[in-house]
Interface confidence: low
C-alpha cells in the first residue's frame, strides 16, 4: 500500500493549561523506519517526540504504538503553554543502516494556537 502521512487538522486552538491531541495516521508502516514529530521546518526545526522510548514531559502517544499493525501516531500534549504554539509536523523516516535515517514523507502540518485563559 502506498505510504501517506495524514494530519487531518490544519489547526487546533487550545487554552493555556489544557491538553490537545495532534492527530497523525499512516497508510503503511513500510519502509521500515521511525515516525517523529517536529515543530517548525528546516534545519532549525525542533524534535518534539519520536516514539523511541525516551521520557518527554507533557507528551504521550495516544494509541498503543507497540501493536503490530498500529497506524496511529497521534500525540497528546498536556498543560499547553504559549511556548508550544507553532506548526507541528508528523514525519516518516526510512531507517538507515550505517547512514542517518532518511526523511521520506511529512504530514501537511497542524498549527497549534494557544489561547490565554
Amino acid at each position: 500500500k502506498e505510504l501517506k502521512v495524514t494530519q487531518p487538522e490544519k489547526s487546533v486552538s487550545v487554552a493555556a493549561g489544557d491538553s490537545t491531541v495532534l492527530n497523525c495516521t499512516l497508510t503503511s508502516l513500510l519502509p521500515v523506519g521511525p515516525i517523529r514529530w517536529y515543530r517548525g521546518v528546516g534545519p532549525s526545526r525542533l524534535l518534539i517526540y519520536s516514539f523511541a522510548g525516551e521520557y518527554v514531559p507533557r507528551i504521550r502517544n495516544v494509541s498503543d504504538t507497540t501493536k503490530r499493525n498500529n497506524m496511529d501516531f497521534s500525540i497528546r500534549i498536556s498543560n499547553v503553554t504559549p511556548a508550544d504554539a507553532g506548526i507541528y509536523y508528523c514525519v516518516k523516516f526510512q531507517k538507515g543502516s550505517s547512514e542517518p535515517d532518511t526523511e521520506i514523507q511529512s504530514g501537511g502540518g497542524t498549527e497549534v494556537y494557544v489561547l490565554a485563559k
Epitope: 523511541a52 522510548g53 525516551e54 521520557y55 514531559p57 507533557r58 507528551i59 504521550r60 502517544n61 494509541s63 498503543d64 504504538t65 507497540t66 501493536k67 498536556s78 498543560n79
Partner: antibody, heavy 124, light 106 residues
C-alpha cells in the same frame, strides 16, 4: 499470558553488590519499557529504576542514584538491575514491571503487569 | 510523593472513589491493588483509564485537571486491599502514593 520472572534475591552483605534479573515472556519484550519497583517490609511501593524499550534511556530513583545500573537484553528478553554498596535500607521485595503501550521508564502510570517479586535482605 | 487518602470504606454493592494528586504536568495515573503485604501488586488501571483484560469492568479510572480517580462500582468483599496510585514527575522520576486501604464493611 504475560509473565515476568525475577531472580537473584537472597541474603546480601552490607557494602556488597547484587544483580537481579527479570525474564519476560508472552509479549514482544523489545517494544515495552520496563521498571524495577521495591517494597520494604511494612512500607509502601518505591520506584527504583526504569529503562526504555530500546535500552537507550535509563532512569533512577533518588535512593539508588549512583549505585544502580539498569540494563536490558532484548534478544534474551531480560532486564537486569545491578545495585552496589548495599545498605540495610535496600532490604525489600523487588518487583519487575512492564509498561503497556505508553510511556517510558519512570512512567509508573503505564505499568500494566508485575512479576511475583524477589526478596532481598541486606544484613551482616 | 503523590497524595491519596489513607483509608476509605464502603458496604458491598456501593460505589467507592479513591483520588490521587500531585503527578507531574504529564498528569497520567495508574492504580495498583495489593491484597496483602509481600504479595505482588496487580494493575487495575493504567494510563488514566485503560483496564488490563483480566480486570473486571467494575474498576474504572479517570482524570480531571491534575487529579486521578479510581472508581470501583458494586464493591465486593474481594476488593478489600491497599490501592496505590503511580505517576511520574516532571523530571521523569517515578512516584507512588502512600496507599489507600479499602475496607469493605459488613
Amino acid at each position: 499470558a504475560v509473565t515476568l520472572d525475577e531472580s537473584g534475591g537472597g541474603l546480601q552483605t552490607p557494602g556488597g553488590a547484587l544483580s537481579l534479573v527479570c525474564k519476560g515472556s508472552g509479549f514482544t519484550f523489545s517494544s515495552h519499557a520496563m521498571n524495577w519497583v521495591r517494597q520494604a517490609p511494612g512500607k509502601g511501593l518505591e520506584w527504583v529504576a526504569g529503562i526504555s524499550s530500546d535500552g537507550r534511556f535509563t532512569y533512577y530513583g533518588a535512593a539508588v542514584q549512583g549505585r544502580a545500573t539498569i540494563s536490558r537484553d532484548n534478544g534474551q528478553s531480560t532486564v537486569r538491575l545491578q545495585l552496589n554498596n548495599l545498605r540495610a535500607e535496600d532490604t525489600a521485595t523487588y518487583y519487575c514491571t512492564k509498561n503497556g503501550g505508553c510511556g517510558s521508564g519512570g512512567d509508573l502510570d503505564c505499568i500494566d503487569a508485575w512479576g511475583h517479586g524477589t526478596e532481598v535482605i541486606v544484613s551482616s | 510523593a503523590l497524595t491519596q487518602p489513607a483509608s476509605v470504606s464502603a458496604n458491598p454493592g456501593e460505589t467507592v472513589e479513591i483520588t490521587c494528586s500531585g503527578g507531574g504536568s504529564n498528569n497520567a495515573y495508574g492504580w495498583f491493588q495489593q491484597k496483602s503485604p509481600g504479595s505482588a501488586p496487580l494493575t487495575v488501571i493504567y494510563d488514566n483509564g485503560k483496564r488490563p483484560s483480566d480486570i473486571p469492568s467494575r474498576f474504572s479510572g479517570s482524570k480531571s485537571d491534575s487529579t486521578g480517580t479510581l472508581t470501583i462500582t458494586r464493591v465486593q468483599a474481594e476488593d478489600e486491599a491497599v490501592y496505590y496510585c503511580g505517576s511520574a514527575d516532571n523530571s521523569g522520576a517515578g512516584v507512588f502514593g502512600a496507599g489507600t486501604t479499602l475496607t469493605v464493611l459488613g
